[in-house]
């Protein structure tokens, strides 16, 4: 169950999709990727307050136990719910190939 | 790619499966669950240092960008990679039913 999308901490503070610009050097890819030279990396960043975008029953349990035992049980964490595919032009032993990666860019986010 | 399982922070400090004992009251389930009275909740807890149990390419990117921009990009987070099903005896309008939940107990963990 995907729970409430209202962020009690204020606009933009809770778990959501962010875009971070990164070069091949930033990503440590310069030695094996030729293109793109820069990637608009979409990732999930933000707090997961009680029941905000809870991914499933496990996330709801985590919220309850974090409230009881904050030093033992961490709050749920903002992670990708799904991904957008992306292609990379990458070096091979013999030249280059165009490779699709399905797990590289976050498409949307939830708390787990 | 599931990366290294060696924890550089010391035994038990990195992302792994933990068991937390919780009552129905702890979980906020007392009004709709009859049994079990207590649950051994398995959850994923621990740090996600560089490339430790990286779930996918996205986790590897997150590690790289966290190193570069620690105030903007959080480290990967320890979350369930899969779940174990669990049955609950729950109250219904007419009595009780046995319900299976597939997303309640973490089975194993990774960093994402």
């Amino acid at each position: 169950a995907r729970n409430g999308d209202h962020c009690p901490l204020g606009p933009g503070r809770c778990c959501r999709l962010h875009t971070v610009r990164a070069s091949l050097e930033d990503l440590g890819w310069a030695d094996w990727v030729l293109s793109p030279r820069e990637v608009q990396v979409t990732m999930c960043i933000g707090a997961c307050p009680s029941q905000f975008r809870a991914a499933n029953m496990h996330a709801q349990i985590k919220t309850s136990l974090h409230r009881l035992k904050p030093d033992t049980v961490p709050a749920p964490c903002c992670v990708p719910a799904s991904y957008n595919p992306m292609v990379l032009i990458q070096k091979t032993d013999t030249g280059v190939s165009l490779q699709t990666y399905d797990d590289l860019l976050a498409k949307d986010c939830h708390c787990i | 790619a599931r990366n290294g399982d060696h924890c550089p922070l010391g035994p038990g400090r990195c992302c792994r499966l933990h068991t937390v004992r919780a009552s129905l009251e702890d979980l906020g389930w007392a009004d709709w669950v009859l049994s079990p009275r207590e649950v051994q909740v398995t959850m994923c807890i621990g740090a996600c240092p560089s490339q430790f149990r990286a779930a996918n390419m996205h986790a590897q990117i997150k590690t790289s960008l966290h190193r570069l921009k620690p105030d903007t990009v959080p480290a990967p987070c320890c979350v369930p990679a899969s779940y174990n099903p669990m049955v609950l005896i729950q109250k219904t309008d007419t009595g009780v039913s046995l319900q299976t939940y597939d997303d309640l107990l973490a089975k194993d963990c990774h960093c994402i």
């Epitope: 293109s35 032009i89 860019l105 | -």
Partner: antibody, heavy 118, light 107 residues
Framework: QVTLQESGPGLVKPSETLSLTCSFS??????????VGWIRQPPGKGLEWLAH???????YFNTALKSRLTISKDTSKNQVSLKLSSVTAADTATYYC??????????WGQGTSVTVSS | DIVMTQSPSSLSTSVGDRVTITCKAS??????VAWYQQKPGKSPKFLIY???YRYTGVPDRFSGSGSGTDFTFTISSVQPEDFAVYYC?????????FGGGTKVEIK
């Protein structure tokens, strides 16, 4: 397996608008870094790049033809359309569409022949 | 627009010979030059990316080199199936532009 197939009218009258469709399979135009481009080749001549459209809907056009070209995509139907207005005999050519990954055009359709004549 | 000037426009050669085609850009394009092969009645086939990188599945007798404005495409030992027209293309900036083509014929 990646395939692209161009379709068009075959014959167009001068001053009319040429409409071409590229239907493709084996890849998605919602994939970051993917685009579809159009290239033409007049009979017995070389290749001329016309336009391309990217996954994020960014569009680029041949400078000389920009005012006459329109490109659009239907991601759900796996189709890209190209329109060329006010055609003349000089637009007679085989029109190709090609799959692009950034600046690579690695898969091409077999081409569709278009003649501009009254 | 960047003009790509290809030479020669045609050449005659025999099976087993070495063939070299040159392409000159009207301005610096770094290494952003691709090469294509086109056989009669067929669509172009992508061979070389970024001056020197062979694309997946392209035989190693095909190679490319160069940077800036001067580029070279070489077939080290021409095979019967290599008789075709070859085009260079700059992918440095849009509008992308092609050279005029080089027809490789049997002597």
């Amino acid at each position: 397996q990646v395939t692209l197939q161009e379709s068009g009218p075959g014959l167009v009258k001068p001053s009319e608008t040429l409409s071409l469709t590229c239907s493709f399979s084996g890849f998605s135009l919602s994939t970051y870094g993917i685009g579809v481009g159009w290239i033409r080749q007049p009979p017995g001549k070389g290749l001329e790049w016309l336009a391309h459209i990217w996954w994020n809907n960014n569009k680029y056009f041949n400078t000389a033809l920009k005012s006459r070209l329109t490109i659009s995509k239907d991601t759900s139907k796996n189709q890209v359309s190209l329109k060329l207005s006010s055609v003349t005999a000089a637009d007679t050519a085989t029109y190709y569409c090609a799959r692009m990954g950034y600046d690579i055009m690695d898969y091409w359709g077999q081409g569709t022949s278009v003649t501009v004549s009254s | 627009d960047i003009v790509m000037t290809q030479s020669p426009s045609s050449l005659s050669t025999s099976v087993g010979d070495r063939v070299t085609i040159t392409c000159k850009a009207s301005q610096d394009v770094n290494t952003a030059v691709a090469w294509y092969q086109q056989k009669p009645g067929k669509s172009p086939k992508f061979l070389i990316y970024s001056s020197s990188y062979r694309y997946t599945g392209v035989p190693d007798r095909f190679s490319g080199s160069g940077s800036g404005t001067d580029f070279t495409f070489t077939i080290s030992s021409v095979q019967p199936e290599d008789f075709a027209v070859y085009y260079c293309q700059q992918h440095y900036s849009t509008p992308w532009t092609f050279g005029g083509g080089t027809k490789v014929e049997i002597k």
